[in-house]
Interface confidence: medium
Protein backbone atom coordinates (compact mmCIF):
# COMPACT_ATOMS: atom_id res chain seq x y z
CA UNK A 1 0.00 0.00 0.00
CA UNK A 2 1.20 3.52 -0.84
CA UNK A 3 0.80 5.76 2.24
CA UNK A 4 1.49 9.00 0.35
CA UNK A 5 -2.12 10.23 0.41
CA UNK A 6 -2.84 9.65 4.10
CA UNK A 7 -3.98 12.48 6.36
CA UNK A 8 -0.80 12.58 8.43
CA UNK A 9 -2.02 15.20 10.90
CA UNK A 10 -5.04 13.06 11.80
CA UNK A 11 -2.87 9.98 12.17
CA UNK A 12 -0.51 11.92 14.44
CA UNK A 13 -3.45 13.05 16.58
CA UNK A 14 -4.70 9.48 16.95
CA UNK A 15 -1.24 8.30 17.90
CA UNK A 16 -0.67 11.00 20.50
CA UNK A 17 -4.12 10.54 21.95
CA UNK A 18 -4.38 6.81 22.28
CA UNK A 19 -1.98 4.49 20.41
CA UNK A 20 1.06 5.79 22.32
CA UNK A 21 -0.56 4.92 25.65
CA UNK A 22 -1.19 1.35 24.56
CA UNK A 23 2.38 0.97 23.33
CA UNK A 24 3.78 2.30 26.60
CA UNK A 25 1.46 0.06 28.63
CA UNK A 26 2.68 -2.92 26.60
CA UNK A 27 6.25 -1.86 27.39
CA UNK A 28 5.48 -1.43 31.11
CA UNK A 29 8.66 -1.73 33.14
CA UNK A 30 10.91 -1.21 30.14
CA UNK A 31 11.39 1.67 27.76
CA UNK A 32 12.47 2.24 24.19
CA UNK A 33 15.92 3.29 25.43
CA UNK A 34 16.43 -0.24 26.79
CA UNK A 35 16.79 -1.46 23.19
CA UNK A 36 18.86 -0.28 20.27
CA UNK A 37 16.74 1.17 17.47
CA UNK A 38 17.71 -0.75 14.35
CA UNK A 39 14.73 0.24 12.20
CA UNK A 40 14.38 3.78 10.88
CA UNK A 41 12.39 5.75 8.34
CA UNK A 42 13.09 8.83 6.27
CA UNK A 43 9.70 10.42 5.58
CA UNK A 44 6.06 10.07 6.62
CA UNK A 45 4.90 7.48 4.05
CA UNK A 46 8.06 5.45 4.66
CA UNK A 47 7.49 5.59 8.44
CA UNK A 48 3.93 4.30 8.02
CA UNK A 49 5.15 1.51 5.74
CA UNK A 50 7.63 0.38 8.39
CA UNK A 51 5.05 0.78 11.18
CA UNK A 52 2.57 -1.36 9.26
CA UNK A 53 5.18 -4.02 8.61
CA UNK A 54 6.36 -4.25 12.24
CA UNK A 55 2.82 -4.14 13.64
CA UNK A 56 1.05 -6.62 11.39
CA UNK A 57 3.65 -8.95 9.87
CA UNK A 58 4.38 -11.86 12.22
CA UNK A 59 8.04 -12.70 12.77
CA UNK A 60 9.35 -16.10 13.93
CA UNK A 61 10.10 -14.84 17.45
CA UNK A 62 7.14 -12.48 17.82
CA UNK A 63 3.96 -13.68 16.15
CA UNK A 64 1.14 -12.13 18.14
CA UNK A 65 1.41 -8.31 18.01
CA UNK A 66 -1.47 -7.89 15.57
CA UNK A 67 -3.93 -8.89 18.29
CA UNK A 68 -2.72 -6.24 20.76
CA UNK A 69 -4.80 -3.17 21.50
CA UNK A 70 -2.26 -0.79 19.95
CA UNK A 71 -2.30 -2.85 16.75
CA UNK A 72 -6.08 -2.79 16.52
CA UNK A 73 -6.08 0.98 17.02
CA UNK A 74 -3.28 1.42 14.48
CA UNK A 75 -5.29 -0.56 11.96
CA UNK A 76 -8.41 1.52 12.61
CA UNK A 77 -6.42 4.74 12.30
CA UNK A 78 -4.83 3.74 8.99
CA UNK A 79 -8.20 2.57 7.66
CA UNK A 80 -9.76 5.88 8.64
CA UNK A 81 -7.12 8.28 7.34
CA UNK A 82 -5.48 6.44 4.43
CA UNK A 83 -7.78 6.22 1.36
CA UNK A 84 -8.26 2.65 0.20
CA UNK A 85 -6.17 1.14 2.99
CA UNK A 86 -8.93 -1.07 4.43
CA UNK A 87 -9.55 -2.70 1.04
CA UNK A 88 -5.92 -3.77 0.79
CA UNK A 89 -6.15 -5.44 4.19
CA UNK A 90 -9.12 -7.75 3.56
CA UNK A 91 -7.01 -10.67 2.31
CA UNK A 92 -4.48 -10.19 5.09
CA UNK A 93 -7.26 -10.17 7.70
CA UNK A 94 -8.78 -13.42 6.44
CA UNK A 95 -5.40 -15.08 6.65
CA UNK A 96 -5.35 -14.22 10.36
CA UNK A 97 -8.74 -15.75 11.19
CA UNK A 98 -7.05 -18.83 12.66
CA UNK A 99 -6.58 -17.32 16.11
CA UNK A 100 -3.75 -18.47 18.31
CA UNK A 101 -3.84 -18.34 22.08
CA UNK A 102 -2.26 -15.10 23.28
CA UNK A 103 1.33 -15.75 24.22
CA UNK A 104 3.16 -14.25 27.17
CA UNK A 105 5.04 -11.10 26.12
CA UNK A 106 8.51 -12.16 25.04
CA UNK A 107 11.64 -10.04 25.08
CA UNK A 108 11.64 -10.17 21.27
CA UNK A 109 8.14 -8.73 21.20
CA UNK A 110 9.22 -6.00 23.61
CA UNK A 111 12.12 -5.25 21.31
CA UNK A 112 9.78 -5.07 18.33
CA UNK A 113 7.40 -2.71 20.14
CA UNK A 114 10.39 -0.62 21.13
CA UNK A 115 11.24 -0.32 17.42
CA UNK A 116 7.62 0.70 16.79
CA UNK A 117 7.88 3.48 19.38
CA UNK A 118 11.00 4.71 17.63
CA UNK A 119 9.27 4.70 14.24
CA UNK A 120 6.27 6.60 15.60
CA UNK A 121 8.54 9.19 17.20
CA UNK A 122 10.33 9.54 13.88
CA UNK A 123 6.97 9.91 12.12
CA UNK A 124 6.05 12.77 14.45
CA UNK A 125 9.41 14.47 14.04
CA UNK A 126 9.12 14.40 10.25
CA UNK A 127 5.62 15.80 10.66
CA UNK A 128 6.91 18.66 12.79
CA UNK A 129 9.38 19.52 10.05
CA UNK A 130 6.49 19.55 7.54
CA UNK A 131 8.52 17.61 4.99
Amino acid sequence: YDFTNCDFEKIEADYLRTISKDLITYMSGTKSTDFNNTVSCSNRPHCLTEIQSLTFNPTPRCASLAKEMFARKTKATLALWCPGYSETQINATQAMKKRRKRKVTTNKCLEQVSQLLGLWRRFIRTLLKKQ
Epitope: R17, I24, K31
Partner: antibody, heavy 120, light 108 residues
Protein backbone atom coordinates in the same frame (compact mmCIF):
# COMPACT_ATOMS: atom_id res chain seq x y z
CA UNK B 1 -7.24 26.98 20.54
CA UNK B 2 -7.63 24.43 23.33
CA UNK B 3 -9.50 25.86 26.30
CA UNK B 4 -10.48 24.34 29.64
CA UNK B 5 -12.56 26.38 32.08
CA UNK B 6 -13.35 25.11 35.56
CA UNK B 7 -16.26 26.28 37.70
CA UNK B 8 -18.18 25.28 40.81
CA UNK B 9 -15.57 25.97 43.48
CA UNK B 10 -16.40 27.70 46.76
CA UNK B 11 -16.62 27.39 50.52
CA UNK B 12 -18.11 24.21 51.96
CA UNK B 13 -18.28 22.71 55.45
CA UNK B 14 -16.51 19.45 56.36
CA UNK B 15 -18.69 16.51 55.40
CA UNK B 16 -20.37 18.55 52.67
CA UNK B 17 -20.49 18.04 48.92
CA UNK B 18 -19.54 20.05 45.86
CA UNK B 19 -19.63 19.45 42.14
CA UNK B 20 -16.98 20.95 39.88
CA UNK B 21 -17.35 21.35 36.12
CA UNK B 22 -14.78 21.78 33.37
CA UNK B 23 -16.00 23.13 30.04
CA UNK B 24 -13.77 22.15 27.12
CA UNK B 25 -13.48 23.74 23.69
CA UNK B 26 -11.10 23.86 20.74
CA UNK B 27 -10.62 20.09 20.42
CA UNK B 28 -12.58 16.85 20.08
CA UNK B 29 -13.28 16.39 23.77
CA UNK B 30 -14.69 12.85 23.44
CA UNK B 31 -11.37 11.52 22.13
CA UNK B 32 -9.28 12.42 25.16
CA UNK B 33 -8.54 11.07 28.61
CA UNK B 34 -9.36 13.86 31.08
CA UNK B 35 -8.00 14.45 34.58
CA UNK B 36 -8.44 16.41 37.76
CA UNK B 37 -5.29 17.61 39.53
CA UNK B 38 -5.30 19.67 42.72
CA UNK B 39 -2.90 21.96 44.53
CA UNK B 40 -3.29 22.79 48.22
CA UNK B 41 -2.30 26.36 49.17
CA UNK B 42 1.49 26.68 49.03
CA UNK B 43 1.90 22.99 48.19
CA UNK B 44 2.70 20.88 45.13
CA UNK B 45 0.55 19.26 42.47
CA UNK B 46 -1.45 16.16 43.39
CA UNK B 47 -3.23 13.94 40.88
CA UNK B 48 -6.87 13.35 41.86
CA UNK B 49 -8.17 11.01 39.17
CA UNK B 50 -9.09 10.59 35.55
CA UNK B 51 -11.68 9.31 33.14
CA UNK B 52 -10.71 7.60 29.91
CA UNK B 53 -12.29 8.28 26.56
CA UNK B 54 -15.28 6.17 25.55
CA UNK B 55 -13.12 4.36 23.00
CA UNK B 56 -10.98 3.25 25.94
CA UNK B 57 -14.08 2.11 27.86
CA UNK B 58 -14.62 5.40 29.70
CA UNK B 59 -13.34 3.92 32.96
CA UNK B 60 -12.15 5.95 35.93
CA UNK B 61 -9.21 5.76 38.32
CA UNK B 62 -8.63 7.70 41.53
CA UNK B 63 -5.81 8.59 43.89
CA UNK B 64 -5.98 6.81 47.26
CA UNK B 65 -6.92 9.90 49.37
CA UNK B 66 -10.12 10.54 47.38
CA UNK B 67 -11.17 7.02 46.42
CA UNK B 68 -14.74 6.31 47.46
CA UNK B 69 -15.50 9.99 48.07
CA UNK B 70 -14.92 11.60 44.67
CA UNK B 71 -16.52 10.62 41.36
CA UNK B 72 -15.40 11.75 37.91
CA UNK B 73 -17.80 11.74 34.99
CA UNK B 74 -18.03 13.27 31.55
CA UNK B 75 -20.73 14.43 29.16
CA UNK B 76 -19.25 14.27 25.68
CA UNK B 77 -22.35 15.86 24.16
CA UNK B 78 -21.71 18.96 26.30
CA UNK B 79 -17.90 18.80 26.14
CA UNK B 80 -17.87 18.86 29.93
CA UNK B 81 -15.92 17.05 32.63
CA UNK B 82 -17.27 16.76 36.18
CA UNK B 83 -15.89 16.09 39.65
CA UNK B 84 -18.45 15.18 42.30
CA UNK B 85 -16.87 15.59 45.74
CA UNK B 86 -18.62 14.07 48.76
CA UNK B 87 -17.65 13.75 52.44
CA UNK B 88 -15.26 16.65 52.04
CA UNK B 89 -12.41 17.06 54.52
CA UNK B 90 -10.37 20.14 55.43
CA UNK B 91 -7.39 18.55 53.67
CA UNK B 92 -9.33 18.66 50.38
CA UNK B 93 -8.90 22.45 50.37
CA UNK B 94 -7.07 23.23 47.14
CA UNK B 95 -7.20 24.75 43.69
CA UNK B 96 -8.65 22.07 41.40
CA UNK B 97 -7.46 21.95 37.80
CA UNK B 98 -8.85 19.91 34.96
CA UNK B 99 -6.26 18.76 32.45
CA UNK B 100 -6.13 16.99 29.10
CA UNK B 101 -3.81 14.03 28.74
CA UNK B 102 -1.72 13.36 25.68
CA UNK B 103 1.39 11.40 24.72
CA UNK B 104 3.04 9.15 27.28
CA UNK B 105 0.59 10.17 30.01
CA UNK B 106 1.54 13.87 30.02
CA UNK B 107 -0.89 16.75 30.60
CA UNK B 108 -0.58 19.19 27.70
CA UNK B 109 -3.48 21.54 28.50
CA UNK B 110 -4.74 22.83 31.84
CA UNK B 111 -7.63 24.97 33.00
CA UNK B 112 -7.10 28.08 35.13
CA UNK B 113 -8.28 26.24 38.25
CA UNK B 114 -11.12 26.71 40.74
CA UNK B 115 -10.61 27.09 44.49
CA UNK B 116 -12.37 24.73 46.89
CA UNK B 117 -12.22 25.68 50.57
CA UNK B 118 -13.39 23.17 53.17
CA UNK B 119 -13.79 24.89 56.51
CA UNK B 120 -16.24 25.08 59.39
CA UNK C 1 3.84 3.76 46.50
CA UNK C 2 6.16 5.35 43.96
CA UNK C 3 7.84 8.61 44.96
CA UNK C 4 9.61 11.34 42.99
CA UNK C 5 12.05 13.55 44.87
CA UNK C 6 13.06 17.06 43.78
CA UNK C 7 15.26 19.66 45.48
CA UNK C 8 13.18 22.36 47.14
CA UNK C 9 15.08 25.16 45.42
CA UNK C 10 17.68 25.78 42.74
CA UNK C 11 19.42 29.09 41.99
CA UNK C 12 21.05 30.08 38.73
CA UNK C 13 22.79 33.24 37.54
CA UNK C 14 21.18 35.08 34.66
CA UNK C 15 22.41 33.59 31.37
CA UNK C 16 23.83 30.46 33.00
CA UNK C 17 22.56 26.87 32.95
CA UNK C 18 20.10 25.54 35.54
CA UNK C 19 19.67 21.84 36.22
CA UNK C 20 16.71 20.50 38.19
CA UNK C 21 16.75 16.85 39.18
CA UNK C 22 13.95 14.39 39.82
CA UNK C 23 14.87 11.13 41.56
CA UNK C 24 12.87 7.93 41.69
CA UNK C 25 13.53 4.22 41.84
CA UNK C 26 14.47 3.13 38.30
CA UNK C 27 12.88 6.28 36.91
CA UNK C 28 14.78 5.65 33.68
CA UNK C 29 12.23 2.94 32.84
CA UNK C 30 9.41 5.50 32.88
CA UNK C 31 8.65 8.50 30.72
CA UNK C 32 9.12 11.73 32.63
CA UNK C 33 7.41 15.06 31.98
CA UNK C 34 8.19 18.53 33.32
CA UNK C 35 5.84 21.42 34.10
CA UNK C 36 6.53 25.08 34.75
CA UNK C 37 4.18 26.96 37.09
CA UNK C 38 4.34 30.67 37.73
CA UNK C 39 2.58 32.25 40.75
CA UNK C 40 -1.20 32.35 40.37
CA UNK C 41 -1.11 30.48 37.06
CA UNK C 42 -1.84 26.94 35.87
CA UNK C 43 1.08 24.59 35.12
CA UNK C 44 2.50 24.52 31.60
CA UNK C 45 4.04 21.41 30.02
CA UNK C 46 7.64 22.22 29.01
CA UNK C 47 9.08 18.72 28.41
CA UNK C 48 7.30 15.42 27.75
CA UNK C 49 8.54 11.90 27.09
CA UNK C 50 11.91 12.62 28.79
CA UNK C 51 13.24 15.02 26.19
CA UNK C 52 10.53 16.24 23.79
CA UNK C 53 9.49 19.90 23.69
CA UNK C 54 5.89 20.94 22.98
CA UNK C 55 5.49 23.59 20.32
CA UNK C 56 6.13 27.09 21.67
CA UNK C 57 8.67 25.96 24.28
CA UNK C 58 12.16 27.42 23.64
CA UNK C 59 15.05 25.14 22.70
CA UNK C 60 16.76 26.29 25.88
CA UNK C 61 14.62 23.71 27.71
CA UNK C 62 15.79 20.11 27.47
CA UNK C 63 15.44 16.91 29.42
CA UNK C 64 17.23 13.63 30.07
CA UNK C 65 16.36 10.51 32.01
CA UNK C 66 18.35 7.42 32.97
CA UNK C 67 18.98 5.23 35.98
CA UNK C 68 17.38 6.77 39.04
CA UNK C 69 17.47 10.43 37.96
CA UNK C 70 15.70 12.60 35.41
CA UNK C 71 17.01 16.10 34.76
CA UNK C 72 15.47 19.26 33.37
CA UNK C 73 18.12 21.58 31.91
CA UNK C 74 17.46 25.25 31.23
CA UNK C 75 20.30 26.89 29.35
CA UNK C 76 20.87 30.66 29.12
CA UNK C 77 18.44 31.18 32.01
CA UNK C 78 16.23 34.26 31.80
CA UNK C 79 14.32 36.19 34.47
CA UNK C 80 11.09 34.87 32.93
CA UNK C 81 12.16 31.29 33.72
CA UNK C 82 11.75 31.95 37.43
CA UNK C 83 8.97 29.60 38.52
CA UNK C 84 8.16 26.32 40.24
CA UNK C 85 9.03 23.21 38.22
CA UNK C 86 7.40 19.81 38.72
CA UNK C 87 8.40 16.44 37.32
CA UNK C 88 5.76 13.78 36.68
CA UNK C 89 5.83 10.12 35.75
CA UNK C 90 3.24 7.41 35.27
CA UNK C 91 3.64 4.54 37.69
CA UNK C 92 1.60 1.40 37.07
CA UNK C 93 0.30 1.29 40.62
CA UNK C 94 -0.18 4.96 41.47
CA UNK C 95 -1.05 5.95 37.87
CA UNK C 96 0.23 9.54 37.92
CA UNK C 97 2.90 10.78 40.30
CA UNK C 98 4.28 14.30 40.69
CA UNK C 99 7.51 15.37 42.35
CA UNK C 100 7.27 17.86 45.21
CA UNK C 101 8.34 20.76 43.03
CA UNK C 102 11.47 22.91 42.76
CA UNK C 103 11.52 26.69 43.04
CA UNK C 104 13.92 28.12 40.45
CA UNK C 105 15.44 31.50 41.29
CA UNK C 106 17.28 33.47 38.60
CA UNK C 107 19.90 35.73 40.18
CA UNK C 108 21.08 39.05 38.80
Amino acid sequence: EVQLVESGGGLVKPGGSLRLSCAASGFTFSDYWMHWVRQAPGKGLEWVGHIKSKTDAGTTDYAAPVKGRFTISRDDSKNTLYLQMNSLKTEDTAVYYCAREIYYYAFDSWGQGTLVTVSS
Amino acid sequence: SYELTQPLSVSVALGQTARITCSGDNIGSKYVHWYQQKPGQAPVLVIYGDNERPSGIPERFSGSNSGNTATLTISRAQAGDEADYYCQAADWVDFYVFGGGTKLTVLG
